[in-house]
């Protein structure tokens, strides 16, 4: 906490500029003018502030402004976003998807902080649902975002939203969140032809049910065995030999090395020995 | 990353001069800084002297400006600080920092990363 002192003469500022480096603390405290400093926010990034002095200008805004700072302050925080915690964001209410962009950048090449979880969950909070724009932007800069989120939170992403999702944003989820996710990556891409249709819902894959799986082994689609691996193992079991072998095409041989993992070994042990015959690969039921 | 190692403090009689060192590892680029700071017994640091080496432009503070003077050997990836003049109240502990402009990329945005030496005390004393 830096004292109350008067500014001495000659040394108010009057704007945000480079001549403020040589201000000690407490001269920052009392020659700069709070309401200056927020609306040339956007000079003090540019200006080589030490952190210590850093400290100071926030110290300024959180006087300011104690119900939380308005957006246009926000947009330009800059550095200053990594000094906040999470109880200075949730006083925040971040509508604008730049404003979003700006603080993530800032962030950028570091894992989810604390910071940016909190100011995440306001964001989505205040739009009411994960739409495709911010879905696009938080799996940009965060690609397990998607993954971090519970069932209950991915319940209110809209299925429009899931063009925006990449193969390696589900890398991480479980069955429960791909549970929720496959239903609606079906009904995004519903109208797709068969081959489009495959390499897009591949990924969610993992919380399909048997009888869209059954529908895809009609479809020629060559699925391949790290897909084939995570499906859930409930909707492997009920199907037949000759349904994984239309449904795995030429990849049907991976089963072999395969056979003593999860969903591979309990489907073979549901299958008659005469029907993996056929395959033959040499799988013991 | 970039380390800085300072050198050249030691004990001097008012009058005379000193040069300190700060040797940088790590790469130095043009949007970035180079300051030398100071923090005498009891008081807060304060910046004495500094480059922007995009626009090669020196910066002082009021106390001592003419008297000391701030250089760069690009060669060496070293930093100077030339004081002559000393006076008893320039004793210090003079640190040397860099202030690397860490850009985000996709706009012009950005701000500045520090990085600090461990200090080298001055002392001006008869």
């Known amino acids: 906490e830096v004292e109350k002192t008067a500014c001495p003469s000659g040394k108010k500022a009057r704007e945000i500029d480079e001549s403020l480096i040589f201000y000690k603390k407490w001269e920052l405290e009392a020659c700069v003018d709070a309401a200056l400093l927020a609306t040339q926010m956007d000079r003090v990034n540019a200006i080589p502030f030490t952190y210590e002095q850093l400290d100071v200008l926030k110290h300024k805004l959180d006087e300011l402004y104690p119900q939380g700072y308005p957006e246009s302050v926000i947009q330009h925080l800059g550095y200053l976003f990594l000094k906040m915690s999470p109880e200075d964001i949730r006083k925040w209410n971040v509508t604008s998807l730049e404003t979003l962009k700006a603080l993530l950048e800032v962030n950028k090449g570091h894992e989810m902080s604390p910071q940016v979880a909190t100011l995440i969950d306001r964001f989505v909070k205040g739009r009411g649902q994960l739409d495709k724009d911010t879905l696009d932007t938080l799996t940009a800069f965060y690609p397990g975002y998607l993954c971090s989120l519970s069932p209950e939170e991915l319940s209110s992403v809209p299925p429009s939203s899931i063009w925006a999702v990449r193969p390696q944003d589900l890398d991480t989820c479980d069955p429960r969140q791909l549970d929720v996710l496959y239903p609606k990556a079906r009904l995004a891409f519903q109208n797709m032809n068969g081959s489009e249709y495959f390499v897009k819902i591949q990924s969610f894959l993992g919380g399909a049910p048997t009888e869209d799986l059954k529908a895809l082994s009609q479809q020629n689609v060559s699925m391949d065995l790290a897909t084939f691996m995570k499906l859930r193992t409930d909707a492997v079991l009920p199907l037949t030999v000759a349904e994984v072998q239309k449904l795995l095409g030429p990849h049907v041989e991976g089963l072999k090395a395969e056979e003593r993992h999860r969903p591979v070994r309990d489907w073979i042990l549901r299958q008659r020995q005469d029907d993996l015959d056929t395959l033959g690969l040499g799988l013991q039921g | 990353q970039v380390q800085l190692v300072e050198s050249g403090g030691g004990v001097v009689q008012p009058g005379r001069s000193l040069r300190l060192s700060c040797a940088a590892s790590g790469s130095i680029f043009e949007s970035d800084r180079m300051h030398w700071f100071r923090q005498a017994p009891g008081k807060e640091r304060e910046l004495v002297a500094g480059i922007n080496i995009g626009t090669n432009t020196y910066y002082y503070a009021d106390s001592v400006k003419g008297r000391f003077t701030i250089s760069r050997d690009n060669s060496k990836n070293t930093l100077y600080l030339q004081m002559n003049s000393l006076r008893a109240e320039d004793t210090a502990v003079y640190y040397c920092?860099?202030?690397?402009?860490?850009?985000?990329?996709?706009?012009?945005?950005?701000?500045?990363?520090?990085?600090w030496g461990q200090g080298t005390l001055v002392t001006v004393s008869s």
């Open positions: 920092a860099a202030f690397l402009w860490k850009s985000y990329g996709s706009s012009d945005g950005g701000y500045y990363l520090q990085y």
